[in-house]
Structure formats: structure tokens, C-alpha cells
Amino acid sequence: DPVKPSRGPLVTCTCESPHCKGPTCRGAWCTVVLVREEGRHPQEHRGCGNLHRELCRGRPTEFVNHYCCDSHLCNHNVSLVLEATQPPSEQPGTDGQ
């Protein structure tokens, strides 16, 4: 969805996910999200970010990795990896605080 003009300067990003309306989107920053759901292969989604920039600072876990960048199509060739499975006592949480 288009972001309101008052949001500040926008960047054009590669959009590759089931919810993309086209090959690119415009947002406050670009994103790559790598997600692994139980019993499935990891899926990498590319798109735009406008809210909750704090997710960009979250540590990768065995289930999710968020990457953010701020320049034109900067998310196009980025490939992410997930953390290796760790013993339960050492697993990082998904809460980025």
C-alpha cells in the first residue's frame, strides 16, 4: 500500500512475497525476512518497512532473521541465514528488547 507523503523520504525496494502487488514497493526502508515455520523449509521474503524499525535490531534465531537497509533496491541480492539450533537453555528469544 502507498505510504502517506508525511512519512518522509521513501526508498524503492525489491518486493518478493505472496502479498506483493508488484516487483517493487516503496517504503521508509527495505526489508528481508527469513522465516522457518515448524516442519517447513525457510522462506525468504523481500519488501518494504514502515513500522517497528526495532525488528531490524533483533538477533537472528533458529526461526527468524530480519534484515533492513536504507538505499535503492538494497534488499535485492541479500541472502540471510538462520542461527544453528541451540540447546534449550541457550536459545535466543524472538523478543528484540
Partner: antibody, heavy 118, light 108 residues
Framework: QVQLQESGPGLVKPSQTLSLTCTVS??????????WNWIRQHPGKGLEWIGY???????YYNPSLKSRVTISVDTSKNQFSLKLSSVTAADTAVYYC??????????WGQGTTVTVSS | ENVLTQSPGTLSLSPGERATLSCRAS???????LAWYQQKPGQAPRLLIY???SGATGIPDRFSGSGSGTDFTLTISRLEPEDFAVYYC?????????FGQGTRLEIK
């Protein structure tokens, strides 16, 4: 249009865990445009944000509740859930789920009342 | 944490009058992600204004929002009987999300 519906026990005993589920209908919880929030309201008081979850499973919680809160998502069921551990009478409230986008929290559940009492 | 302070706590006005509600933030609200909600007894909050000044879908145009940075205002140009309720401002879009304590708009 998108609708949210909270469900779960209306009565929880002190020291136990409060568990609620929010079911999303009319839209996908997996859209990268939305963040899925829990908010509560104590009787006669204002609104208190509990936390949110993104479709990826990443979460952020209110620092004052963080040690007791877990929010999870089940994209296959189009649901997200709240667990609040070690509850006391001070956790008695109406609990709402809400969808957040650049347009604010534009869709809310009707709310469910949870009473903590033995 | 961005603390939002609403004033006045209670506003007593008559139908047909103009209502002005204030919300002040302890820190600048990024991207003007400031929303206003109306809540009536026994109901969930209803979004009125988002992005400080954009009206939500289906909201009458007598409701308007203004402001930027740390000072925001909700104006109801001509009060209708159904407008008497509690109004909350909210900072969203970055964590922690915070709400103001509310302004109760009551019939004079």
C-alpha cells in the same frame, strides 16, 4: 472486511497462566503490512499495550509485563495468542486484540473480560 | 518510553459546540505516528485519526486531527449527542506503544 475475535477462559485462578487466542477472519495474518497486538483495560481505567507479534513470529512486549508475557502466532490457523503467567487480581481486565498498520490500530476485537479470582 | 499526556481530563460541553482535546508527548513522535480513538462504555476503541491528521475510514468529517512533533490536537467541530465518550491518543509504529490517559467528553 477483516474481523478479530478473542476467545479464552473468563476466569483464571491466581498464580495460574492466562491464555487467550485472537482469530483473524477476512484477511491473512501473514501480510507483511500488519502487526498483531494485545491491549488490555483494567476496570474503569485507560488502555495498556501488552505487546505485538509480526507474521514472522518476532515479538515486542511492554517492558512492565515482559517477564510474564508470551505472544505467539499460528499462521496456518490465522490466529495469534497471548499467555500471561503468574496472574494476580491486578490482571483482571478486558483484553483486546488489534491489527496495527501505518493507519494505526484500525481493527479491534470486541474484547473479552478476564477475571482473576480463586 | 514516549509518555503521552492528555488534557483536559474531563471536558464538559453541549451539543453543537466545538471540542478541542490536547495530547502532548514526552518525545517527538516519529513519522507523526499518532492516532486518536473514541471509546464508549462496553465497546472496543474505534480509530478516528491516524498519522496525526488523516481521518479513518467511515469517520465523520467533523473529526479532525492536527499537530506534529510533541503537540497534537483532536478537534470535533460541532458536537453531536453520539460524540460524548472517552478519547485516547496513541503513539504507534515503534515500541513500546503508548496511550494517553484519556479525556472524558461529557454533556454539560
Amino acid at each position: 472486511q477483516v474481523q478479530l475475535q478473542e476467545s479464552g477462559p473468563g476466569l483464571v485462578k491466581p498464580s495460574q497462566t492466562l491464555s487467550l487466542t485472537c482469530t483473524v477472519s477476512g484477511g491473512s495474518i501473514s501480510s507483511n503490512d500488519y502487526y498483531w497486538n494485545w491491549i488490555r483495560q483494567h476496570p474503569g481505567k485507560g488502555l495498556e499495550w501488552i505487546g505485538y507479534i509480526y507474521y514472522s513470529g518476532s515479538t515486542y512486549y511492554n517492558p512492565s509485563l515482559k517477564s510474564r508475557v508470551t505472544i505467539s502466532v499460528d499462521t496456518s490457523k490465522n490466529q495469534f495468542s497471548l499467555k500471561l503467567s503468574s496472574v494476580t487480581a491486578a490482571d483482571t481486565a478486558v483484553y483486546y486484540c488489534a491489527r496495527e498498520s501505518t493507519d494505526g490500530m484500525d481493527v479491534w476485537g470486541q474484547g473479552t473480560t478476564v477475571t482473576v479470582s480463586s | 518510553e514516549n509518555v503521552l499526556t492528555q488534557s483536559p481530563g474531563t471536558l464538559s460541553l453541549s451539543p453543537g459546540e466545538r471540542a478541542t482535546l490536547s495530547c502532548r508527548a514526552s518525545q517527538s513522535v516519529s513519522s507523526n505516528y499518532l492516532a486518536w480513538y473514541q471509546q464508549k462504555p462496553g465497546q472496543a476503541p474505534r480509530l478516528l485519526i491516524y498519522g496525526a491528521s488523516s481521518g479513518a475510514t467511515g469517520i465523520p468529517d467533523r473529526f479532525s486531527g492536527s499537530g506534529s512533533g510533541t503537540d497534537f490536537t483532536l478537534t470535533i467541530s460541532r458536537l453531536e449527542p453520539e460524540d460524548f465518550a472517552v478519547y485516547y491518543c496513541q503513539h504507534y509504529g515503534s515500541s513500546p506503544i503508548t496511550f494517553g490517559q484519556g479525556t472524558r467528553l461529557e454533556i454539560k
